[in-house]
Amino acid sequence: MMTGTIETTGNISAEKGGSIILQCHLSSTTAQVTQVNWEQQDQLLAICNADLGWHISPSFKDRVAPGPGLGLTLQSLTVNDTGEYFCIYHTYPDGTYTGRIFLEVLESSVAEHGARFQIP
């Protein structure tokens, strides 16, 4: 039975040209995290595998950085980066948990970030 829950940063905004940290946290389960995928609706960005380490999709190599932790840092943001992002936690024995983050990249310099996310 899957008892865990994923906490995410929810809806966040950032300034064009800047950086943003995408962060999720899996709680309320003792399941072992074997892999975390970071994906857009139609594109794999990166994988953090417990054994293999980080693997960044080659097309994002220049502007995606691993971490902090199991999170992902997006750099040199463009308006085209606006959209949904998913953290997909592969766990044993529970199975797969998916969290959703919506990022809005703003043209102006008054982009207000959502409440800072902290891992307990």
């Epitope: 892999q35 594109q43 693997h55 797969t96 959703r100």
Partner: antibody
Framework: QVQLQQPGAELVKPGASVKMSCKAS????????MHWVKQTPGRGLEWIGA????????SYNQKFKGKATLTADKSSSTAYMQLSSLTSEDSAVYYC??????????????WGAGTTVTVSA | DIVMTQSPDSLAVSLGERVTMNCKSS????????????LAWYQQKPGQSPKLLIY???TRESGVPDRFSGSGSGTDFTLTISSVQAEDVAVYYC?????????FGGGTKLEIK
Amino acid sequence: QVQLQQPGAELVKPGASVKMSCKASGYAFTNYLMHWVKQTPGRGLEWIGAINPGSGGTSYNQKFKGKATLTADKSSSTAYMQLSSLTSEDSAVYYCARTGVYGNFLIFDYWGAGTTVTVSA
Amino acid sequence: DIVMTQSPDSLAVSLGERVTMNCKSSQSLLNSGIQKNYLAWYQQKPGQSPKLLIYGASTRESGVPDRFSGSGSGTDFTLTISSVQAEDVAVYYCQNDHRYPFTFGGGTKLEIK
């Protein structure tokens, strides 16, 4: 163009070890995971494990832990798999295969031609 | 581990005939959060390495003829060849692309009558 070059055949004695190579060319070696797959007439295709040439991290199918050891040499863009304590059960074709990113998926997009390992006294 | 079961083991068809082969997984390969199925199909012709045909259960790899199509979701998947050609003689494998260890089906061997 992407190429994965493997030696055609290896003849080894029972109890010995063999180290086979997979030389990659035509792409950035450290940007892609490399996998190894075993094929026998009886059991079909079996995933042995993978290596991240960038970090050196490895992941193994539990069945092949202790049997296979994966390494990679960044300077020569070559992945290696060593098989130890060989028996007739290890006689098979061994493929190296790269995974590329296809949308949301990591897919075996390029395969070597395979190395046929024959274990015989 | 996810067990992949293919059926039939083999089939012989006439040129131009429509053929379907099935693949069943012991666990769901669907991530319902993003509505993606982590299943791939490979074709292996005699004496050759496997070649990618379809990924994501239904997306054809570039250069694969449109007579090949994939369908299904969750645990049940199908590969269809709408009009079999002589060059389609091969063994077809489905593969769990969802989680390690990646696992393959036992294959379906396609022959021409």
